[in-house]
Interface confidence: low
Amino acid sequence: KAMHVAQPAVVLANSRGTASFVCEYASPGKATEVRVTVLRQADSQVTEVCAATYMMGNELTFLDDSICTGTSSGNQVNLTIQGLRAMDTGLYICKVELMYPPPYYMGIGNGTQIYVIDPEPCPDSD
């Protein structure tokens, strides 16, 4: 079953290569287990950036070496992606799945265009 997912259209990463955005979903029921996946679309190729399954009210748990972190509050997920470089500029899509209890719902946002600008190297001081 389809579900609406909203996310900001554009986000600019900070000078340390970190970008944060909110992914909000319109839950049709009271889900207790939610899976959030961040996908990146660039050059017509879609790739998975990170994914986490969490119990409502608990922290999101990503893989140990994931570049993503996140917190949840109600039907909102606050996502942070770290370690971004200019080459990582692209459309980052939030996919939300309500895993439990049935029925299963899935929604995909329109994507957040994340712009990453590599910082200029500091000039050598003589």
């Epitope: 996946t37 990146r40 990170c50 893989l63």
Partner: nanobody, 125 residues
């Protein structure tokens, strides 16, 4: 160092099914994308399917789409390939591989750093 050991190959009749497994050792295997490739006799090795580190994304060659299903169990460090509706042209040595990226599902051999020894699948009546 990553080690990959495939199993599950064998002789099967056309229309039959097989499930290949690839047991991986090493942390890189569970945190990186993995793939299946195959090499038929006298042909070049070709991409079959790939799956991202967490299993959220999969990719398939057109020739196997709808018949093969890739999956992984990171708790067991194992990659799987469920092959249904097998055809004679699926006969090949099947290799599993670990990519150097966590999320990118590459279709070319040089994007994969570690390879298994392969398991032979023969589809014949």
């Amino acid at each position: 160092e990553v080690q990959l050991v495939e199993s599950g190959g064998g002789l099967v009749q056309p229309g039959g099914s097989l499930r290949l497994s690839c047991a991986a050792s090493g942390r890189t295997a569970s945190s990186n994308a993995m793939a299946w490739f195959r090499q038929a006799p006298g042909k070049e090795r070709e991409f079959v399917s790939a799956i991202s580190a967490t299993g959220g994304l999969t990719a398939y060659a057109d020739s196997v789409k709808g018949r093969f299903t890739i999956s992984r169990d990171n708790s067991k460090n194992t990659l799987y390939l469920q092959m249904n509706s097998l055809r004679a042209e699926d006969t090949a040595v099947y290799y599993c591989a670990v990519g150097r990226e966590r999320w990118y599902l590459r279709h070319t051999e040089n994007e994969y750093d570690y390879w298994g020894q392969g398991t032979l699948v023969t589809v014949s009546s």
